[in-house]
């Protein structure tokens, strides 16, 4: 039993103890604000270059935003005793460019992780699984927020960014319990095949503000719990029958498709027919054509088959440059 004392402090500039004694388990790290009652530690906009070592054991919410962490090594949050209560970890905007395998190991209660707005040139395949085993121990993560983690072009690795992120999501099947995944604003051109198959518990998937051109090779079939699918602000031209059927087969889903450059030609007929009868698409009356020029700004729901034609393909001999 502890009596109430100054085990937490809002004073952000508490100096570390000068003596060689280990820090008190519930003291507040320098450059941080702490509330034991709120189980929260905020080390925000302090230009920290590493994770504080003397985090209080009570911490459930840890904000390390707006710092200069650069690299998150293996065991970055491993402590003795462990931070057994830590449930929400926000590392957004901390100039991370490398997250190594096992970075989040020894956090048995970690439910929510936000790595948004970090230019991740390297995300280890084992960042979330913690090991290179083909089947890892399940991660406790329920929410994983990875918005705007794409690095600048000059910092990209040789392999595709999409592939790097996908490898981390599927490694060891560790994220089978994930309910929420945000991947907005990452310049994704495609979604690697089979990623979603490894995330069967997803309820919320945000892929908005990417550069997705097609969903042809993406399977939503086993996402039977999916409630929200955000595909706004991509480069989608049309959704084909296979995708339409899969989305229609999901019992709870709501799909958001605003601000895509829909191509209203003969290939759009099935999607228009589907839109007219489905309850799956939110704001479907706002969807408009972007191409061809003659169809620009036409509302998809108002089109009929006569509107959706394709220019005949001319034989080579008749084509002109």
């Amino acid at each position: 039993t502890s009596s109430a004392s100054s085990s937490s402090s809002s004073a952000p500039f508490l100096a570390s103890a000068a003596s060689a004694q280990p820090p008190l388990p519930d003291q507040c790290p320098a450059l941080c604000e702490c509330s034991e009652a709120a189980r929260t530690v905020k080390c925000v906009n302090r230009n920290l270059t590493e994770v504080p070592t003397d985090l209080p054991l009570y911490v459930r919410n840890l904000f390390l935003t707006g710092n200069q962490l650069a690299v998150l090594p293996a065991g970055a949050f491993a402590r003795r005793p462990p931070l057994a209560e830590l449930a929400a970890l926000n590392l957004s905007g901390s100039r991370l460019d490398e997250v190594r395998g096992g970075a989040f190991e020894h956090l048995p209660s970690l439910r929510q992780l936000d790595l948004s707005h970090n230019p991740l040139a390297y995300l280890s395949p084992f960042a979330f699984s913690g090991s290179n085993a083909s089947i890892s121990a399940p991660s406790p993560l329920v929410e994983l927020i990875l918005n705007h983690i794409v690095p600048p072009d000059d910092k990209r690795q040789n392999r595709s960014f999409e592939g790097m992120v996908a490898a981390a999501l599927v490694a060891g099947r560790a994220l089978q319990g994930l309910h929420l995944l945000e991947l907005a604003s990452n310049h994704f051109l495609y979604l690697p095949r089979d990623v979603l198959a490894q995330l069967p518990s997803l309820r919320y998937l945000d892929l908005s503000n990417n550069s997705l051109v097609s969903l042809t090779y993406v399977s939503f079939r086993n996402l039977t719990h999916l409630e929200s699918l955000h595909l706004e602000d991509n480069a989608l031209k049309v959704l084909h029958n296979g995708t339409l059927a899969e989305l229609q087969g999901l019992p709870h889903v709501r799909v958001f498709l605003d601000n895509n450059p829909w191509v209203c030609d003969c290939h759009m007929a099935d999607m228009v027919t589907w839109l007219k009868q489905t309850g799956v698409v939110q704001g479907k009356d706002r969807l408009t054509c972007a191409f061809p020029e003659k169809m620009r700004n036409r509302v998809l729901l108002e089109l009929n088959s006569a509107d959706l034609d394709c220019d005949p393909i001319l034989p080579p001999s008749l084509q002109t440059s």
Partner: antibody, heavy 125, light 107 residues
């Protein structure tokens, strides 16, 4: 629905003991941290004591330290306040209050989000 | 211990009035502050947490502001059901402490 029901209040002489109970229903008691808060007649609110969801952490106000003990029985969905060496100044309505944090919750701390209706303790000779 | 001082201790106002209650902490508490409403013979009800975040279900006429040592609860347009006593509470550190309360009465 979520409900906290206090009991065990009454009139007691100074120096004697009393045990308050708070029966919980409508949520997973074993996942939530809990508090006792009191209010003397015509006065403001005073936090008394806190216990974590598993009983591993307890905190007391200086005014009750060494006299009051908070405990819980998760199998019975019940929170307790053992009050010894009672004084006249302990006369108050005693509320049990749920902390908004649960073991599985991540996100903002909302303070004490659910309160019981209170039980009255009168310490008088 | 952190002392919380509320002012005024009571005020009279009419329906439709804008009401402001202040709370001062004896030392910096960042934004670790909650506001509660209590009606006679009833348990307190949580209104605001983290100094300015509205609890679910609380009308938007209630708002909170401040950080560090000085905080404010504002009711933009007082309604009949808002006549009550309001308490601030710090949760920067244990022991948790409440302000002395502000009773809002009908003018």
């Amino acid at each position: 629905q979520v409900q906290l029901v206090e009991s065990g209040g009454g009139v007691v002489q100074p120096g004697r003991s009393l045990r308050l109970s708070c029966a919980v229903s409508g949520f997973t008691f074993s996942s939530y941290d809990m508090n006792w808060v009191r209010q003397a007649p015509g006065k403001g609110l005073e936090w008394v004591t806190f216990i974590s969801y598993d009983g591993s952490n307890k905190y007391n106000a200086d005014s009750v330290k060494g006299r009051f003990t908070i405990s819980r029985d998760n199998s019975k969905n019940t929170l307790y306040l053992q009050m010894n060496s009672l004084r006249a100044e302990d006369t108050a309505v005693y509320y049990c209050a749920r902390d908004s944090y649960s073991r599985s919750w991540y996100g903002d701390y909302y303070g004490m989000d659910v309160w019981g209706q209170g039980t009255t303790v009168t310490v008088s000779s | 211990d952190i002392q919380m001082t509320q002012s005024p201790s009571s005020l009279s106002a009419s329906v439709g009035d804008r009401v402001t209650i202040t709370c001062r902490a004896s030392q910096g508490i960042s934004s670790w502050l909650a506001w509660y409403q209590q009606k006679p013979e009833k348990a307190p009800k949580s209104l605001i947490y983290a100094a300015s975040s509205l609890q679910s279900g609380v009308p938007s006429r209630f708002s909170g502001s401040g950080s560090g040592t000085d905080f404010t609860l504002t009711i933009s347009s007082l309604q009949p059901e808002d006549f009550a006593t309001y308490y601030c509470q710090q949760y920067n550190s244990y022991p948790l402490t409440f302000g002395g309360g502000t009773k809002v009465e009908i003018k």
